[in-house]
């Protein structure tokens, strides 16, 4: 029986040209994490395997950095990076757990404008 739950950073926004950390955490299970896949809309970004370590897809090598931990750092963000990201935890003996993060990449001026309105 799968008892675990995935906690994620949920919906996040970041500035164009900046970077962001995508983070998921598996809790409430003693299952062993054998691999974590990071995906974006039917594209493989990276894999972290318990035995083999990290594999970053060639097309993302310049903009994706492994970690911290099982998370993923996206760099040099563009508006095209806006969308859904998934962390897929492969565990033994539970099976697969999936977490979802929505990232919105904002134009620099929009991000700054939004920040000014949030500060009294």
């Amino acid at each position: 029986m799968m008892t675990g739950t995935i906690e994620t950073t949920g919906n996040i926004s970041a500035e164009k040209g900046g970077s962001i950390i995508l983070q998921c955490h598996l809790s409430s299970t003693t299952a062993q994490v054998t691999q974590v896949n990071w995906e974006q809309q039917d594209q493989l970004l990276a894999i972290c395997n318990a035995d083999l370590g990290w594999h970053i897809s060639p097309s993302f090598k310049d903009r994706v950095a492994p970690g911290p931990g099982l998370g993923l750092t996206l760099q040099s963000l563009t508006v095209n990076d806006t969308g859904e990201y998934f962390c897929i935890y492969h565990t033994y003996p539970d099976g697969t757990y999936t977490g979802r993060i929505f990232l919105e990449v904002l134009e620099s001026s929009v991000a700054e404008h939004g920040a000014r309105f949030q500060i009294p």
Epitope: E39, L44, I47, L52
Partner: antibody, heavy 118, light 107 residues
Framework: EVQLLESGGGLVQPGGSLRLSCAAS????????MHWVRQAPGKGLEWVAY????????SYADSVKGRFTISRDNSKNTLYLQMNSLRAEDTAVYYC???????????WGQGTLVTVSS | DIQMTQSPSSLSASVGDRVTITCRAS??????LNWYQQKPGKAPKLLIY???SLQSGVPSRFSGSGSGTDFTLTISSLQPEDFATYYC?????????FGGGTKVEIK
């Protein structure tokens, strides 16, 4: 250099048994899942069986389930395929393949021919 | 089981030609699609993994694209050593399945 070397193929009668071996070198064998894939003469590729690196969980094609057993000895860096109740349709070249990250087969052995005939 | 349908089953082309091979899955397989090249009497060789990632050491004239159910292998400028049979393979779920193959022959 990664190397996979199959052995154990040969001519066997229908209903007979054979054990194939795949000797691995050049990488940490226990860290990788492994597949057996076969190819009948003049035909395409057919997946046969799969075994995980350390956990040892396995999976089989329906065509061989209950007759073939995949296993591994990580201390010997060797993968095995025990083939029982062999049929004429099992005649093929059998390849072992390494599977990093569970998604693709990046290295293959040269294959060993199994012929089932009376 | 997931069926993989490759087309065409064979094609004739000349050195320098752009060649496109397609592979269709019977259900969505996300990016879990790999391409292999096989020459007579030899083991298959990995060309493209995860739909679009070029395997280390494979010439950049090979490229892969697609996701979901429809995938494409493209050879931008066919070379003499590229005449071979090409297979797609899904690793989304077991049983793993291969396409029927596409034989690329010299025109």
């Amino acid at each position: 250099e990664v190397q996979l070397l199959e052995s154990g193929g040969g001519l066997v009668q229908p209903g007979g048994s054979l054990r194939l071996s795949c000797a691995a070198s050049g990488f940490t064998f226990s860290s990788y899942s492994m597949h057996w894939v076969r190819q009948a003469p003049g035909k395409g590729l057919e997946w046969v069986a799969y075994i995980k690196g350390s956990a040892g969980s396995t999976s089989y094609a329906d065509s061989v389930k209950g007759r073939f057993t995949i296993s591994r000895d990580n201390s010997k860096n060797t993968l095995y395929l025990q083939m029982n109740s062999l049929r004429a349709e099992d005649t093929a070249v059998y390849y072992c393949a390494r599977v990093p990250y569970g998604v693709w087969m990046d290295y293959w052995g040269q294959g060993t021919l199994v012929t089932v005939s009376s | 089981d997931i069926q993989m349908t490759q087309s065409p089953s064979s094609l004739s082309a000349s050195v320098g030609d752009r060649v496109t091979i397609t592979c269709r899955a019977s259900q969505s397989i996300s990016y879990y699609l790999n391409w292999y090249q096989q020459k007579p009497g030899k083991a298959p060789k990995l060309l493209i993994y995860a739909a679009s990632s070029l395997q280390s050491g494979v010439p950049s004239r090979f490229s892969g694209s697609g996701s979901g159910t429809d995938f494409t292998l493209t050879i931008s400028s066919l070379q003499p050593e590229d005449f071979a049979t090409y297979y797609c393979q899904q690793s989304y779920s077991t049983p793993l399945t291969f396409g029927g193959g596409t034989k690329v022959e010299i025109k």
